[in-house]
Interface confidence: medium
Amino acid sequence: SEVEYRAEVGQNAYLPCFYTPAAPGNLVPVCWGKGACPVFECGNVVLRTDERDVNYWTSRYWLNGDFRKGDVSLTIENVTLADSGIYCCRIQIPGIMNDEKFNLKLVIKPAKVTPAPTRQRDFTAAFPRMLTTRGHGPAETQTLGSLPDINLTQISTLANELRDSRLANDLRDSGATIRIG
């Protein structure tokens, strides 16, 4: 089931998706698509990165974070009601059944009459939390051996966590790092 995120018409929507490269530059290709994740790749691609850079994007869709550190969260600028729907973030690790794919549901609400806050960046719902492995320490690390040397830590998003977007902003701005391993 998809995790739900909300934004208002005219605001920027934020759909979180993360992994942790072993080192900046050791990147895994990532695609963002409109619609649920298919078997391979992304459908209706809106943005794509390769091992080095963002190599495809469409207007209003961009990565606001440092994708070279694994922050591949999608920002959708100036959203309209038509932007509602499911979005797929896919971390394209080599191997069948090895991709990490996440379906995120974006719900766009009509704009409020009240003036928008000065802080424009809209962390629409849950600040993502890391999935842990039962019986372990705080979380898990995946090493991709002889493939691109990645400690993959794609973080699943849980909609009921840290719903206060101001808190999410504060956490983010205070330099809190979400790193597994």
């Epitope: 059944m97 090895n98 492995t133 898990e140 995946q142 991709l144 051996g145 794609q154």
Partner: antibody, heavy 119, light 110 residues
Framework: QVQLVQSGGGLVQPGGSLRLSCAAS????????MSWVRQAPGKGLEWVSG????????YYADSVKGRFTISRDNDKNSLYLQITSLRAEDTAVYYC????????????WGQGTLVTVSS | SYVLTQPRSVSGSPGQSVTLSCTGT?????????VSWYQQHPGKAPKLMIS???ARPSGISNRFSGSKSGNTASLTISGLQAEDEADYYC??????????FGAGTKVTVL
């Protein structure tokens, strides 16, 4: 060389539960997706479940969804299959297998462990 | 309930060639080049013989070859030998992100 050593099979009553284990060695375990395949006595192979290298993305055959749970512990190089609400038709030899990275195949298999569901 | 269709048995004399078929749909065999073939002797674990329709893993004899046309994959064993007598299973990745197998073909060396 790649080794997959299985344990955890046995005789279980209908409705019971069982956890199968598969200890891996000889390869970078967390790099590879893994699968469970079963074979009922005198029958063919049936893929039942798979899991991504990180352990965060599980896959299930429709026939076992809701009753089987696949998991892995990359620190211990181990793969698990938790089976609940066991039925007579779950009686089979269960194999763990390593998914190849570059092909769609299962190149390495465990020795198999027999699960018998009977009252 | 096996999704892929295989003949129940095939037989041949030593030195002959036999071809095993595996028929699926556009959602599995026809849709992806992720067709594999496995050999299984009684009481043993399956052994990968062919991957990705026609690729032979190292250590597998070149007497084994694979191909695909449309929704049907084939395994050909040439120069049949006594040790080839076994059950052979085809498998395919599917559009549901799962694997499916055939019911298996018993190869008998006469």
């Amino acid at each position: 060389q790649v080794q997959l050593v299985q344990s955890g099979g046995g005789l279980v009553q209908p409705g019971g539960s069982l956890r199968l284990s598969c200890a891996a060695s000889g390869f970078s375990f967390s790099t590879y997706a893994m699968s469970w395949v079963r074979q009922a006595p005198g029958k063919g192979l049936e893929w039942v479940s798979g899991i991504s290298g990180s352990g965060r993305t599980p896959y299930y055959a429709d026939s076992v969804k809701g009753r089987f749970t696949i998991s892995r512990d990359n620190d211990k190089n181990s793969l698990y299959l938790q089976i609940t609400s066991l039925r007579a038709e779950d009686t089979a030899v269960y194999y763990c297998a390593r998914n190849d990275i570059f092909t769609g195949s299962l190149p390495d298999w465990g020795q198999g462990t027999l699960v018998t569901v009977s009252s | 309930s096996y999704v892929l269709t295989q003949p129940r048995s095939v037989s041949g004399s030593p030195g002959q060639s036999v071809t095993l078929s595996c028929t699926g749909t556009s959602s599995d065999v026809g849709g992806y080049n992720y067709v594999s073939w496995y050999q299984q002797h009684p009481g043993k674990a399956p052994k990968l013989m062919i991957s990705d329709v026609s690729a032979r893993p190292s250590g597998i004899s070149n007497r084994f070859s694979g191909s695909k046309s449309g929704n049907t994959a084939s395994l050909t064993i040439s120069g049949l030998q006594a040790e080839d007598e076994a059950d052979y299973y085809c498998s395919s990745f599917t559009s549901s992100s799962t694997y499916v197998f055939g019911a298996g073909t018993k190869v008998t060396v006469l």
